[in-house]
Interface confidence: low
């Protein structure tokens, strides 16, 4: 509204008059009139400072658009009627505090607040940076920002933060890694971090195992396994204690017996070999290396079951050039043997009775030449021969030829045999079996108690001229020993040979009865004696043990025996008791 | 919180060379394994590189002698220099982290064109 | 190198219907402090690959329980409960227990 002019006050006191001046004007009395002055914070609308136009108006004046503003730097200004008001953005702060207006005392000026000098402003496990008007906080190394914390950082979960072989032990803030036993660092130092040292295993197999073992080195470890044949004290197979020993183990002493029956254990240091008992050889499907070493019964003899027990006719099959001395033994020997080897050819070999035995032949023609050798060199001859008619003979009823012959007669030899396959069926039945003019009788019992496996079979041999080379003076009394100025003895019969499959060869509960042929009629005053060849003397001998006489006539002899085996009878004349 | 962002793709010329960035927040380089897989275009992922906690360095066979991981603990910034650039090292490559248990924390990937 | 087989590499399933994924190592995943460092990851189209699993059976943080982790030695499955909309994408296993890292080929699961 436009205020009325009015006349002054000529008395000097205009100001009384409150409508003068407009608001937030102050009005001031002059000598003879007065004027009107807007307030501090306000501007008069004509722009002059003192004014009595009633149409002049006092306006604010804002103090905070004014440039630079009147707070200063880092603050924030508020305009208000007549004035303003001062207060310091948030991080920073004045001496005279906030909401400064002009007239309170002191300087309003707004600094940073160190807010890390407040301990709790940042949390556990970080770092506070100040900055101007702010701050922050950043996680100390091992540490990781998770929902305003600071959270431990497990290093040990990273596949890699240490090297194989160590341990990672979490720490706060932190971690190490320690190499496991048996490891060393290759830094030298006990704990490490990362990947720069590495966990190098230690050898302990330099001096921990004892003799006879084997150390094998493990990571971070070592055992000690005793060698093959040797077994440890603390009876652990595989040991790391420093006192146990490794002993050898006596493979023989086993029960049953490592090598299995029929066989012959040698121990040795660590070791052991197997071998068989006679009549027995090393089944060749097995073997002691593979653990499966068995013996199996010879069926029949061959060139390497004859060998072993006699040393001349090893030196025959040396390889080496044979000693002149022994070139005709050898001649002999080697004419037997390579009979025998075609019969031992291999196990499909079909053996004809008649052939082989016709083979025999030669041999027997040049008996006669034996008598220029030593007495150990016919009758190692002689147990061959006599050993490898009998193998022949076993061997045709091993692998018999398509047309069996049950009876080879020749000029030097006879031989007749029988396989067993009905014949034995009812009881108390006895065999009889004839070779030249000298026969064999023997009971089914006997034949069963041998104890054959598969095809049973007998047979009986007799020998023209053998007795000629065999003679007297081969004979061996095993109850006494005889010297010739009290007798004379002479033998007097072609030697026989009584063959059968079985395994048993003496020992019979029933006798087997030979009746031998005499080559010259028997006088009064002899006396026969039944012979058995034994291979147990010397390359081998005559002796009476296992036969009695049954029977004694002019033209033949009935021997008792109880055994299988070749024989002959030698008479004896002058003072010879015999029971 | 945790944020991996990579940077310094482009197109370049076969033989050329290039440098990817991939700068590290909310955690130290020194507490995890930081690797680079990459995806060349229709194809599965390829890992490439890695500079383990400790500092040591492995790499693909593909990129062995040619490529070098490499970090600045102080700008926690890991770094995969590029070398003797072939056709087939086009792909997105992402920065990732062993973070407590595997890649958990990847970059958004930056695309790397090798072309004439 | 560990080569990782996965299989099948495409996956078609109804929602709601079960899935799994198989993944064969060609070596023993198993590190020698013990762990046996086996993930598997998800990268949805235009994402970068997020972890499901890590150590064979372990859910990473914010993963639904339907998703469950197996296996041992070289032979490892993945398995989904129930598979919903959102779980289309390739999904990735990798070895970190030997240096260098391998992945899988990757499996396209895709709703039918």
């Known amino acids: 509204h436009i205020r009325p002019t009015r006349k002054p006050n000529t008395k000097g006191n205009n100001c009384r008059d409150s409508t003068l001046c407009p608001a937030y004007a102050t009005c001031t009395n002059t000598v003879d009139s007065y004027y009107c002055a807007c307030k501090q914070g306000f501007l008069s609308s004509n722009g002059q400072n003192h004014f009595k136009d009633p149409g002049v108006r006092c306006k604010d004046i804002d103090e905070c658009s004014q440039s630079p503003q009147p707070c200063g730097p880092n603050s924030s200004c508020k305009n208000l009627s007549g004035r303003y008001k001062c207060s310091c953005l948030d991080g920073f702060s004045s001496p005279t505090g906030n909401d400064w207006v002009p007239g309170k005392p002191g300087n309003f000026s707004c600094t940073d607040i160190n807010e890390c000098l407040t301990s709790s402003v940042c949390p556990e496990h970080s770092d506070c940076v100040n900055s101007m008007g702010s701050y922050s906080c950043s996680c100390q190394v091992g540490f990781i920002s998770r929902n305003s914390t600071c959270e431990d950082v497990d290093e040990c979960a990273d596949p890699r933060a240490c090297p194989e072989h160590a341990t990672c032990n979490n720490t706060v803030g932190n971690y190490s890694c320690f190499c496991n036993p048996g490891f060393e660092s290759s830094s030298g130092h006990l704990s490490f971090q990362g990947l720069k040292a590495s966990c190098e295993d230690i050898d302990e197999c330099t001096e921990m195992c004892p003799i006879n073992s084997t150390c094998t080195n493990t990571p971070g470890s070592y055992f000690c396994t005793c060698h093959p044949g040797f077994a440890p004290s603390n009876g652990q197979l595989n040991f790391t204690d420093q006192g146990v020993e490794c002993r050898d183990i006596d493979e023989c002493r086993q029960d049953p017996s490592t090598c299995g029956p029929n066989s012959i254990c040698t121990n040795a240091l660590g070791s052991y070999s197997c071998g068989c008992i006679a009549g027995f050889h090393p089944n060749p499907e097995g073997s002691q290396k593979d653990g499966n070493f068995s013996c199996q019964r010879v069926l029949f003899k061959c060139k390497e079951d004859v060998i072993p027990d006699n040393k001349q006719i090893q030196q025959c099959q040396e390889g080496t050039a044979v000693k002149p001395a022994y070139v005709s033994f050898c001649a002999q020997i080697n004419n037997i043997f390579s009979v025998l080897d075609k019969v031992c050819e291999n196990k499909t070999t079909v053996v004809s009775l008649k052939n082989t035995t016709e083979s025999f032949v030669p041999v027997l023609k040049q008996i006669s030449t034996w008598t220029k050798f030593t007495k150990e060199e016919t009758s190692s001859l002689a147990t061959v021969f006599l050993e490898s008619v009998e193998s022949m003979t076993l061997a045709s009823f091993w692998k018999p030829s398509a047309n069996i012959t049950p009876a080879v007669r020749t000029e030097y030899l006879d031989i007749e045999s029988k396989v067993i396959n009905k014949e034995c069926s009812e009881e108390n039945v006895t065999l009889d079996l004839v070779a030249k003019g000298d026969k064999m009788k023997i009971g089914c019992s006997t034949i069963e108690e041998s104890e054959s496996t598969e095809t049973t079979g007998v047979a009986f041999v007799s020998f023209v001229g053998m007795e000629s080379v065999l003679n007297e003076r081969f004979f061996k009394d095993h109850q006494a020993p005889l010297t010739t100025s009290e007798i004379k003895l002479k033998m007097n019969s072609r030697v026989v040979g009584g063959i059968m499959t079985g395994e048993k060869k003496d020992g019979f509960s029933d006798p087997i009865i030979y009746t031998l042929e005499n080559i010259q009629p028997k006088q009064k005053f002899e006396r026969p004696i039944c012979v058995s060849w034994s291979t147990d003397v010397k390359g081998g001998r005559w002796t009476s043990f296992g036969c009695v006489i049954l029977e004694a006539s002019e033209t033949y002899t009935i021997c008792s025996c109880n055994q299988m085996a070749n024989l002959a009878v030698i008479m004896a004349s002058g003072e010879l008791t015999m029971d | 919180q945790v944020q991996l962002v990579e940077s310094g793709g482009g197109v370049v010329q076969p033989g050329r060379s290039l440098r990817l960035s991939c700068a590290v927040s909310g955690f130290s380089l020194t507490s995890f394994g930081m690797h680079w897989v990459r995806q060349a275009p229709g194809k599965g992922l390829e890992w490439v590189a890695v500079?383990?906690?400790?500092?040591?360095?492995y790499y693909a066979d593909s990129v062995k002698g040619r490529f070098t991981i490499s970090r600045d603990n102080s700008k926690n910034t890991v770094y995969l220099q590029m070398n003797s650039l072939r056709a087939e090292d086009t792909a997105v490559y992402y920065c990732a982290s062993i973070y407590y248990r595997g890649f958990d924390v990847w970059g958004q990937g930056t695309t790397v064109t090798v072309s004439s | 190198d560990i080569v990782m087989t996965q299989s099948p590499l495409s996956l078609p399933v109804t929602p709601g219907e079960p899935a799994s994924i198989s993944c064969r190592s060609s070596q023993s995943l198993v590190h020698s402090n013990g762990n046996t460092y086996l993930e598997w990851y998800l990268q949805k189209p235009g994402q970068s690959p997020q972890l499901l699993i890590y150590?064979?059976?372990n859910r990473a943080s914010g993963v639904p329980d339907r998703f469950s982790g197996s296996g041992s030695g070289t032979d490892f499955t993945l398995k989904i409960s129930r598979v919903e909309a959102e779980d289309v994408g390739v999904y990735y296993c990798?070895?970190?227990?030997?240096?260098?890292?391998?992945f899988g080929q990757g499996t396209r699961l895709e709703i039918k």
């Open positions: 990798v070895q970190g227990t030997h240096v260098p890292l391998t």
């Open positions: 150590r064979v059976s």
């Open positions: 500079i383990w906690s400790g500092g040591s360095t």
